[in-house]
Interface confidence: medium
Amino acid sequence: QGGAAEGVQIQIIYFNLETVQVTWNASKYSRTNLTFHYRFNGDEAYDQCTNYLLQEGHTSGCLLDAEQRDDILYFSIRNGTHPVFTASRWMVYYLKPSSPKHVRFSWHQDAVTVTCSDLSYGDLLYEVQYRSPFDTEWQSKQENTCNVTIEGLDAEKCYSFWVRVKAMEDVYGPDTYPSDWSEVTCWQRGEIRDACAETPTPPKPKLSK
C-alpha cells in the first residue's frame, strides 16, 4: 500500500474501525520532523495531526480517531510547507479487527465449541487454530460467527488453541490485516492446562497477508 514518492513509504492500519494509524518511513527525511495533515471530506480544510508517533525522537506516524467511519482519508505528509507525500485512501480497505475477546471452550466428548464475542460489524471470519504435541503443524477451522465447532479430537491428548479474526477478502479487499491472536490456551480431557508438554512455541502471526 505504500508506493514511494520522494522516498516515502507509508502504511495504513484501521484498527477495529476505531483508530487509523498512518506511519511513514522516509529515508531522505530520517532526521526531520515531518508533519501530517488530513481530512475525511474532500471539501474540508486540512487538520494537523495532534497525536504523533515518534521514532528516535522524530515523527514517524499519526493516530486518528475515526469511529465506525466509511470514509476516504485525504492526507499530506509535509516537510515544513513542502508536501513530500499526498494521497487519499478508502480507510476500510486497511481494516485490522481487534483480537477476539471472552474466548470460551465448551467440550462434548471428542468435540469442542469455541465461542467469543462477535465484533459489532460483519463480513468477518473467526479462525481457530489448534494442535497437539503430536501434530507437526497447526490445524485450522473458521466460521463467519465466533462459534466454531471442531470435531474428531482425541480426549486423551492435550491441545493448544488460539483464535483470531480476519476481514473477508471479497468484501474488504486484499490489503486488510488479521487481528492479533488471542492468548494460547491448552486443554486436555475437557480441562484447562498450563501447557501441553513438548508443544513447540506457536509461530508468531504475520501482520499482513
Epitope: 500500500q1 514511494a4 466509511d70 499526498t86 494521497a87 485512501r89 478508502w90 476500510v92 471479497d170 479487499g173
Partner: antibody, heavy 120, light 107 residues
Framework: QVQLVQSGAEVRKPGSSVKVSCKAS????????ISWVRQAPGQGLEWMGG????????KYAQKFQGRVTITADKSTSTAYMELSSLRSEDTAVYYC?????????????WGQGTLVTVSS | DIQMTQSPSTLSASVGDRVTITCRAS??????LAWYQQKPGKAPKLLIY???SLESGVPSRFSGSGSGTEFTLTISSLQPDDFATYYC?????????FGQGTKVDIK
C-alpha cells in the same frame, strides 16, 4: 465469474433525472466498491463516484457532487446511480464497474454500459 | 484533481511493431496507476495495475513501467487484436482520474 448487468438505454429531457441499475451475479455487490464511470460520445472516461455496500455510504467526484446519488441494495446485489438536473452534456454511456484488487482503485469487472440520451 | 496526460493521442502502427504509450501525472502518484484497453462499443478492460502488475489473463506482450509522474505502457509485438484505445488511470488520490486516451490504429 463476476458479471455486472446494467439496465437498458434511457432517453430523458433536460432538467429531469435518470436512474440506472447494475446487478451483480457470480458475486455480490458488497465485493469491493462499485463505481460509476461515464463516457460521452467520442470522449474519454470519467469517474463519477463509488459506494462500499458493506457500509452503504457513497463518495462522489467533485464535479458531480449534489447531482449524483449512488446507492446499493445488498439483498438484491444491485447498485444504482441516479443523476438529476440533466443537461445535454450528460448524454453518455454510463458504466458500473467493480473496484479491483489494488487498493480498490482499479476496475476489474465492468457492466455492458447504459446509453443515456438527454434531448429536448 | 490530479490531471493525467497521455501521449501520443493517436498512434499508427503495424502488426509486429513495438508500441509505447506514455502517461504523465500532474503530481506524484507513486505506483498507483492502471492501464485499460477499450474497443468501440465495448467496456474498458483492465490490463495493468500498480504501474507494472499484469492483470490475470492478459497476454505477456503487455507491460507497464514507471513511478512518480512518468509511466509507460509497452506492447512488445502488436497483434491484430491490439488495435484499440488505451487509457491510463490514477488511483492515488480521489477523484480517480483517467488520461484522455491513445488510439492505436493500423498504419
Amino acid at each position: 465469474q463476476v458479471q455486472l448487468v446494467q439496465s437498458g438505454a434511457e432517453v430523458r429531457k433536460p432538467g429531469s433525472s435518470v436512474k440506472v441499475s447494475c446487478k451483480a451475479s457470480g458475486g455480490t455487490v458488497s465485493s469491493y466498491a462499485i463505481s460509476w464511470v461515464r463516457q460521452a460520445p467520442g470522449q474519454g472516461l470519467e469517474w463519477m463516484g463509488g459506494i462500499t455496500p458493506i457500509f452503504g455510504t457513497a463518495k462522489y467526484a467533485q464535479k458531480f457532487q449534489g447531482r449524483v446519488t449512488i446507492t446499493a441494495d445488498k439483498s438484491t446485489s444491485t447498485a444504482y446511480m441516479e443523476l438529476s438536473s440533466l443537461r445535454s452534456e450528460d448524454t453518455a454511456v454510463y458504466y458500473c464497474a467493480r473496484g479491483g484488487i489494488a487498493a480498490a482503485g482499479t476496475f476489474d469487472y465492468w457492466g455492458q454500459g447504459t446509453l443515456v440520451t438527454v434531448s429536448s | 484533481d490530479i490531471q493525467m496526460t497521455q501521449s501520443p493521442s493517436t498512434l499508427s502502427a503495424s502488426v509486429g511493431d513495438r508500441v509505447t504509450i506514455t502517461c504523465r501525472a500532474s503530481q506524484s502518484i507513486s505506483s498507483w496507476l492502471a492501464w485499460y484497453q477499450q474497443k468501440p462499443g465495448k467496456a474498458p478492460k483492465l490490463l495493468i495495475y500498480k504501474a507494472s502488475s499484469l492483470e490475470s489473463g492478459v497476454p505477456s506482450r503487455f507491460s507497464g513501467s514507471g513511478s512518480g509522474t512518468e509511466f509507460t505502457l509497452t506492447i512488445s509485438s502488436l497483434q491484430p487484436d491490439d488495435f484499440a484505445t488505451y487509457y491510463c488511470q490514477q488511483y492515488n488520490s480521489y477523484s480517480w482520474t483517467f488520461g484522455q486516451g491513445t488510439k492505436v490504429d493500423i498504419k
